[in-house]
Amino acid sequence: EMGTADLGPSSVPTPTNVTIESYNMNPIVYWEYQIMPQVPVFTVEVKNYGVKNSEWIDACINISHHYCNISDHVGDPSNSLWVRVKARVGQKESAYAKSEEFAVCRDGKIGPPKLDIRKEEKQIMIDIFHPSVFVNGDEQEVDYDPETTCYIRVYNVYVRMNGSEIQYKILTQKEDDCDEIQCQLAIPVSSLNSQYCVSAEGVLHVWGVTTEKSKEVCITIFNSSIKG
């Protein structure tokens, strides 16, 4: 069995398959590494595009697992970033393995908006709550924000009534329809006994990436009475 002392200058293998996955703007780096006789440790560095004097910043240092949460090291989620990972076995280090370019807003996934549906007098009110995401460790909604390009620009709302589907588009910048917590859609109640089922997805500004589609929520109207 080969000890650390026997490893040549370039004999510490480089990590492979460095990938970045992001859900709700919470990016995590993953990589693979071959089985070694001695436990390797890894250092992960991040470089943000568009940052003045951009340089490699340590995100995780000397960790033994094969993932690293880099959410605290992301600047503008619309900007590109790169990640590199190196391994260390004993006193020797591998070369860096580099990720592909990644932009949290463009390449990540965002969860669905939450929906609430209710009847108010002669109309059905649908509340579309912005998905919550984590930016620099802080929870916030992906509502319209003129200071960033990473926000939900429009909601596609799908209303199924007695089998036929109708689509509504809601622009989030319009303050009458939306605020920093939610958007609202009102539709008239038909006089017939009807079931209304609603789902929605957000579309992000710039790249047009869509959030996950919400689960359908339904309400049934029986002769002006209501059953959720």
């Epitope: 109309q123 109708i166 989030t172 319009k174 009458d176 009102a186 008239p188």
Partner: nanobody
Framework: EVQLVESGGGLVQAGGSLRLSCAAS????????MGWFRQAPGKEREFVAA????????TYADSVKGRFDISRDNGKNTLFLQMNSLIPEDTAAYYC?????????????????WGQGTLVTVSS
Amino acid sequence: EVQLVESGGGLVQAGGSLRLSCAASGSTFSTYVMGWFRQAPGKEREFVAAISRSGGTTTYADSVKGRFDISRDNGKNTLFLQMNSLIPEDTAAYYCAARAGPAIGRTANDYHSWGQGTLVTVSS
């Protein structure tokens, strides 16, 4: 009650474009949900598009989705319908309609104020 007057109709070749306008007067325009409907000869009046009071929410009939664009200018009390890639089946009288309150209707019964209509003819 709001009064509505449509304009912008006319004869156009298939594949062409038209922009309809609907001027509102007599009431605060921004308090109304607005819609466009059309009625071809011998047919029932059908929904085309509707827009919320602020202009932020829109909905379209499947037959015009991707070709027609509804918008409004609350400062000028005017509703618009931009019609592109017109086809002969779009030939009809086009009516604008108003509905008080926030609910965005898609049936003629949902609207209480109507214009007199403007005729759009699409030749093949």
